[in-house]
């Protein structure tokens, strides 16, 4: 159905990392434009990205209002220059997105090791608490604020002279690990949400090694 010179959007895909959320679709428009609508299951439709020739729409501002809600979006197709035109059923062509629940599905962004400090045979490794675009009382929440204890970090650490990676886990943003005296270690962290069934892990942080600038060494 629809007018002969418009085609419905397809391959609607949510791309979301740390709640920055963009809906993407195909095809690249030829003589047509798109408008996106988003709603929760029980809510009203809200229009975004009016009459755009883009094939993506940033819906972050909408989904961060309640990241635990489930959202549905739809993409309307209109003939370029004649956006009042509708399909044969009196409605513009549109396609629905898959449902999207940000809290359960947003990808975990690559974490960053903020610092590490060695005191004797103990090393304290601190993970940067990344800011998200989720707001509460006009302040942006960190990843830890949003996920609480649902978010854990896995630390991979290894002697610079070895390849075997030991692991440690924390549900804060700090690790305290035992190391061998006189050995240099390298570190990488991974964010994990064990309660999820999909998108459980982040990519690893950049590797940081002792003897580099981020660390501090104190001999006791």
């Amino acid at each position: 159905s629809g007018t002969t010179n418009t085609v419905a959007a397809y391959n609607l895909t949510w791309k979301s990392t740390n709640f920055k959320t963009i809906l993407e679709w195909e095809p690249k428009p030829v003589n047509q434009v798109y408008t996106v609508q988003i709603s929760t299951k029980s809510g009203d439709w809200k229009s975004k990205c009016f009459y755009t020739t883009d094939t993506e729409c940033d819906l972050t501002d909408e989904i961060v209002k309640d990241v635990k809600q489930t959202y549905l979006a739809r993409v309307f197709s209109y003939p370029a220059g004649n956006v009042e035109s509708t399909g044969s059923a009196g409605e513009p062509l549109y396609e629905n997105s898959p449902e999207f629940t940000p809290y359960l599905e947003t990808n975990l962004g690559q974490p960053t090791i903020q610092s590490f400090e060695q005191v004797g045979t103990k090393v304290n490794v601190t993970v940067e608490d990344e800011r998200t675009l989720v707001r509460r009382n006009n302040t942006f929440l960190s990843l830890r604020d949003v996920f609480g204890k649902d978010l854990i970090y896995t630390l991979y650490y290894w002697k610079s002279s070895s390849s075997g990676k030991k692991t440690a886990k924390t549900n804060t943003n700090e690790f305290l690990i035992d190391v061998d005296k006189g050995e240099n270690y390298c570190f990488s962290v991974q964010a994990v949400i064990p309660s999820r069934t999909v998108n459980r892990k982040s990519t690893d942080s950049p590797v940081e090694c002792m003897g580099q600038e981020k660390g501090e060494f104190r001999e006791i």
Epitope: K149, T167, P194, K201
Partner: antibody
């Protein structure tokens, strides 16, 4: 349904090699950690090593370090245990198991049926 | 490496008995201890994780507790299907380590 199926066990001479496979179904291995555990005849459980299939991180027990290699092919949803320079004391049933977390505590919630490796001349 | 010392290595009990198996960690492992049951010729099965949490589908007669570095698996009323070998495992540090096992036999 979550399932792990090991294969590749058998009889091998000392100094020989064998590759065990652990085919997973019902979940995606890249979201978890895969461990290998072995049990010599009439003995207890001995941890062999792990892999994080998402990033390839591995660690091995001292008893197998330098001889065994764990790898994973996420496209096949399968983990592997490559065993080289095998010794008589490596004779055991080898299990792969999925590790998950509750909070920060890890546990092995699903195990394969095991595959027997016998090292003998 | 952390040692997990399990005791007793074997015990004989009757159906209906209360059975207690202990594991002592050589250093602090927080709550990162799991208990497994293994029957002859079969793979181990998870019973308890995080020291005291009952795994899904495991009968409520099984329970776990922690006191410092001592961990206990209790079977409140032993059933015929519970005759097996039980292992503790710490996952607090790498490498994870198992206890030596406790074989529960019929008296």
């Amino acid at each position: 349904e979550v399932q792990l199926v090991e294969s590749g066990g058998g009889l091998v001479q000392p100094g020989g090699s064998l590759r065990l496979s652990c085919a997973a179904s019902g979940f995606t291995i890249s979201g978890y950690w895969i461990h290998w555990v072995r049990q010599a005849p009439g003995k207890g459980l001995e941890w062999v090593g792990y892999i994080d299939p998402y990033n390839g991180a591995t660690y091995y027990a001292d008893s197998v370090k330098g001889r065994f290699t764990i790898s994973a092919d996420t496209s096949k949803n399968t983990a592997y245990l490559q065993m080289n320079s095998l010794r008589a004391e490596d004779t055991a049933v080898y299990y792969c198991a999925r590790a998950d977390y509750y909070g920060v505590d890890e546990f092995l919630d699903y195990w394969g049926q095991g595959t027997l490796v016998t090292v003998s001349s | 490496d952390i040692q997990m010392t399990q005791s007793p290595s074997s015990l004989s009990a009757s159906v209906g008995d209360r059975v207690t198996i202990t594991c002592r960690a050589s250093q602090d492992v927080n709550t990162a201890v799991a208990w497994y049951q293994q029957k002859p010729g079969k793979a181990p099965k998870l019973l308890i994780y995080s020291a005291s949490f009952l795994y899904s589908g495991v009968p409520s007669r099984f329970s776990g507790s922690r006191s410092g570095t001592d961990f206990t698996l209790t079977i409140s009323s032993l059933q015929p299907e519970d005759f097996a070998t039980y292992y503790c495992q710490q996952h607090y540090t790498t490498p994870p380590t198992f206890g030596q096992g406790t074989k529960v036999e019929i008296k």
